[in-house]
């Protein structure tokens, strides 16, 4: 599932390159392992912002698929309460390219621990 999430992220990156979206997104670029679920939640919430701002059907479908995949992969620990983690709004705002790169890094963290 996580491998499919990465391919969806690459697809979103390709789709966005053909558009002009200037959004800045809350991005966790240095995820601590004990906060990875919280960070994933922030990434997914911000991904929905991309979908809404793009107004593009392919991006919308890919984001929805990515959320479904991530949800199922995290169904066992998605409700784990992590303490001492940053709120999404406390994270640094970065452009879409940097956001997607950081997103791939966190997904790789999940792949390495699964």
């Amino acid at each position: 599932n996580w491998v499919n999430v990465i391919s969806d992220l690459k697809k979103i990156e390709d789709l966005i390159q053909s558009m002009h979206i200037d959004a800045t997104l809350y991005t966790e670029s240095d995820v601590h392992p004990s906060c990875k679920v919280t960070a994933m939640k922030c990434f997914l919430l911000e991904l929905q912002v991309i979908s809404l701002e793009s107004g593009d059907a392919s991006i919308h479908d890919t984001v929805e698929n990515l959320i479904i995949l991530a949800n199922n992969s995290l169904s066992s620990n998605g409700n784990v309460t992590e303490s001492g983690c940053k709120e999404c709004e406390e994270l640094e705002e970065k452009n879409i390219k940097e956001f997607l790169q950081s997103f791939v890094h966190i997904v790789q963290m999940f792949i390495n621990t699964s």
Epitope: S51, A57, S58, D61, I67, N72
Partner: antibody, heavy 122, light 112 residues
Framework: EVRLMESGGGLVKPGGSLKLSCAAS????????MSWVRQTPEKRLEWVAT????????YYPDSVKGRFTISRDNAKNTLYLQMSSLRSEDTALYYC???????????????WGQGTSVTVSS | DVLMTQTPLSLPVSLGDQASISCRSS???????????LEWYLQKPGQSPKLLIY???NRFSGVPDRFSGSGSGTDFTLKISRVEAEDLGLYYC?????????FGGGTKLEIK
């Protein structure tokens, strides 16, 4: 008023195939994900398949995965369910339903058709 | 898979009474983004199911305010404050937080 009209049901032998259709009207079909849901003779409901707005992504429960294929033709405003290797437990009334977007709405099935009956028996 | 357990199986009521239907999931159905995709559907005799409530407590357009949904995590409830004749039928809860999406077994609301 949103309209969904299923067709293609009938009597089929175990191991056989059938293709169901769902004609959509009175809404922009390509703006919505769609699902198939079936109701057994005992009145239990079972989710069968979901397809994304553009048709690139499909989802199934294990009970039908590899046997059923959901697809859509946005130009014809039509949803399909290709069923193969049919079993007696696939006997049910099959409904198509429109899905509200997870991102902009509640991810619910807000409108359903009247259903088409499938009987698998020798 | 998430198992959805509905109780009671049958609920005999008098018109004007309050009715309450319970739905319990085998695991939390709060998704990673914090949403709980729990719906309630009503199937009247001879009709297809109709959406009543989505995301636990949101009433679908045209649904009377005597219907209300509540709950969180694994425990959910549908309440009908004053049952009317048109409310009779089969009620189903449904989770679409996690694939495979699953329905409860149904509750038949009938006249006592």
């Amino acid at each position: 008023e949103v309209r969904l009209m299923e067709s293609g049901g009938g009597l089929v032998k175990p191991g056989g195939s059938l293709k169901l259709s769902c004609a959509a009207s009175e809404f922009t079909f390509s703006n919505y994900a769609m699902s198939w849901v079936r109701q057994t003779p005992e009145k239990r409901l079972e989710w069968v398949a979901t397809i994304s707005r553009g048709g690139d992504y499909t989802y199934y429960p294990d009970s039908v995965k590899g046997r059923f294929t959901i697809s859509r033709d946005n130009a014809k405003n039509t949803l399909y369910l290709q069923m193969s290797s049919l079993r007696s437990e696939d006997t049910a009334l099959y409904y198509c339903a429109r899905r509200v977007s997870m991102i902009t709405g509640g991810w619910a099935m807000d409108y359903w058709g009247q259903g088409t009956s499938v009987t698998v028996s020798s | 898979d998430v198992l959805m357990t509905q109780t009671p199986l049958s609920l005999p009521v008098s018109l004007g009474d309050q009715a309450s239907i319970s739905c319990r999931s085998s695991q939390s159905i709060v998704d990673i983004t914090g949403n709980t995709y729990l719906e309630w559907y009503l199937q009247k005799p001879g009709q297809s199911p109709k959406l009543l409530i989505y995301k636990v407590f949101n009433r679908f357009s045209g649904v009377p305010d005597r219907f209300s949904g509540s709950g969180s995590g694994t425990d959910f409830t549908l309440k009908i404050s004053r049952v009317e004749a048109e409310d009779l039928g089969l009620y189903y809860c449904f989770q679409d937080s996690f694939v495979p999406y699953t329905f409860g077994g149904g509750t038949k609301l009938e006249i006592k």
